[in-house]
């Protein structure tokens, strides 16, 4: 906290400019009055003051406005956003993107910080739902953002949103996110034609279900072995050999050297050893020839 | 991405010494550039000052007439010249970028360590 103290003869600042790098911070504090700092805080990003600086800028700042900042000077914070604490930021009101762009632009290259994941949150329920233009945005600074969210977060989604989604923004989704993503992708892209429908659902597949996947082995699709061995394994499991030929096309050579790994592993364990040996691939651990298969689960269903 | 100081060092009172601020990882042209120093138990400092475009600097009352702000955007570097070095002008320089395209980064150097003594 700097001391009060009067601002010296000739130094009360008349514009924010660079000849304030060379005010102690106690003549900022005394000289730099809050509302001319407010109206041109843009320039404070282009003039490099110390953070020790920085801090007596803040300060004042917080003093005009105790509730929170005008989004006025929010969008103009540049620096001094990475000042800010998440206490700060939940006072805010953002609701224009081109202020969140503003500051994540200050932010970009690194790990979203927790300033940052507060202000996305503050911007994304002022909203009440992620949108195709905030989606965009997010996942143009940060690739990672949407597997970042609860399932719950991601129902709020629109389908219309998921055209903003590349397939490296779904890297590090877990099963339970692609399920509540793969219904709204299908959505998005049910007017598609088949093979341009199978490049835009491809990365989503993770979240389908048995009988989506049955469809996609008669339209040709040719799934490569990274996108198979994404699938849920219970969606994997009631498929037949032939389903599974058909699905992976030429690659279905790749299931050999998966044959050890889940879901290959699994379907294999399913299957007739007879059906398996009919794909020439050597895959061992079938059922074997004059064994009866029971479906328990089918006949409790029944029961 | 980062700003290298160089140039300090033990000099005598009357002195002279030309420090240099060069860029790594990105050119310098688009930033306002400060030189700052701090001695030891005080505050930083702000020395001098030099525009983006070169166009415009500014000094601390303390070095007026005795310090020179340059850059030479080809060489991504900024120059500080000072002359007429006392003992008080002792402390570590660090030089700070600032603005950028979208006026969104700054960067600082860690500092070259300058004493003025007999």
């Known amino acids: 906290e700097v001391e009060k103290t009067a601002c010296p003869s000739g130094k009360k600042a008349r514009e924010i400019d660079e000849s304030l790098i060379f005010y102690k911070k106690w003549e900022l504090e005394a000289c730099v009055d809050a509302a001319l700092l407010a109206t041109q805080m843009d320039r404070v990003n282009a003039i490099p003051f110390t953070y020790e600086q920085l801090d007596v800028l803040k300060h004042k700042l917080d003093e005009l406005y105790p509730q929170g900042y005008p989004e006025s000077v929010i969008q103009h914070l540049g620096y001094l956003f990475l000042k800010m604490s998440p206490e700060d930021i939940r006072k805010w009101n953002v609701t224009s993107l081109e202020t969140l762009k503003a500051l994540l632009e200050v932010n970009k290259g690194h790990e979203m910080s927790p300033q940052v994941a507060t202000l996305i949150d503050r911007f994304v329920k002022g909203r009440g739902q992620l949108d195709k233009d905030t989606l965009d945005t997010l996942t143009a600074f940060y690739p990672g953002y949407l597997c970042s969210l609860s399932p719950e977060e991601l129902s709020s989604v629109p389908p219309s949103s998921i055209w903003a989604v590349r397939p490296q923004d779904l890297d590090t989704c877990d099963p339970r996110q692609l399920d509540v993503l793969y219904p709204k992708a299908r959505l998005a892209f049910q007017n598609m034609n088949g093979s341009e429908y199978f490049v835009k659902i491809q990365s989503f597949l993770g979240g389908a279900p048995t009988e989506d996947l049955k469809a996609l082995s008669q339209q040709n699709v040719s799934m490569d072995l990274a996108t198979f061995m994404k699938l849920r394994t219970d969606a994997v499991l009631p498929l037949t050999v032939a389903e599974v030929q058909k699905l992976l096309g030429p690659h279905v050579e790749g299931l050999k050297a998966e044959e050890r790994h889940r879901p290959v592993r699994d379907w294999i364990l399913r299957q007739r050893q007879d059906d398996l040996d009919t794909l020439g691939l050597g895959l061992q651990g079938g059922i074997p020839n004059g064994y009866l298969v029971l479906d328990l689960s089918m006949q409790e269903a029944l029961s | 991405l980062q700003l290298v100081e160089s140039g300090g060092g033990l000099v005598q009172p009357g002195g002279a010494l030309r420090l240099s601020c060069a860029a790594s990882?990105?050119?310098?042209?688009?930033?306002?550039i400060g030189w700052f120093r701090q001695a030891p138990g005080k505050e930083r400092e702000g020395v001098s000052y030099?525009?983006?475009?070169?166009?415009?600097?500014n000094y601390a009352d303390s070095v007026k007439g005795r310090f020179t702000i340059s850059r030479d955007n080809a060489k991504n570097t900024v120059y500080l010249q000072m002359n007429s070095l006392k003992p008080e002008d002792t402390g570590v320089y660090s030089c700070?970028?600032?603005?950028?395209?979208?006026?969104?980064?700054?960067?600082w150097g860690q500092g070259t360590s300058v004493t003025v003594s007999s």
């Open positions: 700070a970028a600032a603005g950028g395209y979208g006026n969104s980064s700054r960067y």
């Open positions: 990882g990105f050119t310098l042209d688009y930033y306002a």
């Open positions: 030099i525009s983006s475009s070169g166009g415009s600097t």
